[in-house]
């Protein structure tokens, strides 16, 4: 039975040209995490693997930095970065947990972080 909860940074906004940290936390389970995938729509951005460490997809190498922790930092944001991002936690023995973050990249300087929310 999957008892865990993913807490994410929720709906967030950031300025064009700036950077943003995407963060997910898995809690309420003693399942052990073996890998975390970060995806944008159907594109793989990065993987943090227990054995191999971080791997950033080649097409995102210049604009994506690993961390902090299991999070992901997006840099040099463009309006095209607006959209859904997913953290996918591969765990044993529970299986897969997925968290969703919606990022809006704004042209203006009015960019505020949304509240955190939880996905069971």
């Amino acid at each position: 039975m999957m008892t865990g909860t993913i807490e994410t940074t929720g709906n967030i906004s950031a300025e064009k040209g700036g950077s943003i940290i995407l963060q997910c936390h898995l809690s309420s389970t003693t399942a052990q995490v073996t890998q975390v995938n970060w995806e944008q729509q159907d594109q793989l951005l990065a993987i943090c693997n227990a054995d191999l460490g971080w791997h950033i997809s080649p097409s995102f190498k210049d604009r994506v930095a690993p961390g902090p922790g299991l999070g992901l930092t997006l840099q040099s944001l463009t309006v095209n970065d607006t959209g859904e991002y997913f953290c996918i936690y591969h765990t044993y023995p529970d299986g897969t947990y997925t968290g969703r973050i919606f990022l809006e990249v704004l042209e203006s300087s009015v960019a505020e972080h949304g509240a955190r929310f939880q996905i069971p």
């Epitope: 807490e7 936390h25 898995l26 809690s27 003693t30 052990q32 995490v33 073996t34 890998q35 975390v36 943090c48 693997n49 227990a50 054995d51 961390g67 902090p68 922790g69 299991l70 591969h90 044993y92």
Partner: antibody, heavy 119, light 113 residues
Framework: EVQLVESGGGLVQPGGSLRLSCAAS????????MSWVRQAPGKGLEWVAY????????YYPDTVKGRFTISRDNAKNSLYLQMNSLRAEDTAVYYC????????????WGQGTTVTVSS | DIQMTQSPSSLSASVGDRVTITCKSS????????????LAWYQQKPGKAPKLLIY???TRESGVPSRFSGSGSGTDFTLTISSLQPEDFAVYYC?????????FGGGTKVEIK
């Protein structure tokens, strides 16, 4: 150079409390999970508490659950273990130990601090 | 909880000897998803903190001499010291990090013959 320095050990009566500290240096403390591991006199090693890098997850074995609380202050590069309702069987050297994210072995250990529970 | 059983509990050996320590777990430490065995080996000298030697059952930690090697899979694991050196006399522990609570073997004390 990675350094973990424990403090706060001492003699305490059964039922008493003690707070251990671990000062970390030489690495990005907030990027690592941390644990406390203890060793009773002449005995083996026992893991007693775990905290994730950001402090949002904590785990304990049944032997200490409800009595021990692990916490951390990433701004101060410090790890803590609050021990309440202490028993004679909690007498041990307590080590803080570092863990790489997604890896749950202990890659660096402090030198330990001794806790003695006795009347 | 996963029980870790080490044998022997102690052994006497001479410098240059090949030493083998075994560790058995009460359930498999192999994750099928990544084919990794979640087992580590540590060395502890008197009055000192444990030191990581081996992780993933067979990967030597950086700076650990090549005479130390780990092998095994599933429930049966071995730590081998190919040619015992004076500084190797210590207590050795295996640890499973497959499932909570993480548990250690009882230790193997390697003494001078």
């Amino acid at each position: 150079e990675v350094q973990l320095v424990e403090s706060g050990g001492g003699l305490v009566q059964p039922g008493g409390s003690l707070r251990l500290s671990c000062a970390a240096s030489g690495f990005a403390f907030s990027d690592y999970d941390m644990s406390w591991v203890r060793q009773a006199p002449g005995k083996g090693l026992e893991w007693v508490a775990y905290i994730s890098d950001g402090g949002y997850n904590t785990y304990y074995p049944d032997t200490v659950k409800g009595r021990f609380t692990i916490s951390r202050d990433n701004a101060k590069n410090s790890l803590y273990l609050q021990m309440n309702s202490l028993r004679a069987e909690d007498t041990a050297v307590y080590y803080c130990a570092r863990q790489i994210l997604l890896r749950y072995y202990f890659d660096y250990w402090g030198q330990g601090t001794t806790v003695t529970v006795s009347s | 909880d996963i029980q870790m059983t080490q044998s022997p509990s102690s052994l006497s050996a001479s410098v240059g000897d090949r030493v083998t320590i075994t560790c058995k777990s009460s359930q498999s430490l192999l994750y099928s998803s990544n084919q990794k065995n979640y087992l580590a080996w540590y060395q502890q000298k008197p009055g000192k903190a444990p030191k990581l030697l081996i992780y993933w059952a067979s990967t030597r930690e950086s700076g650990v001499p090549s005479r130390f090697s780990g092998s095994g899979s599933g429930t049966d694991f071995t730590l081998t010291i190919s040619s015992l050196q004076p500084e190797d006399f210590a207590v050795y522990y295996c640890q499973q990090y497959h499932s909570y609570p993480w548990t250690f073997g009882g230790g193997t004390k390697v003494e001078i013959k």
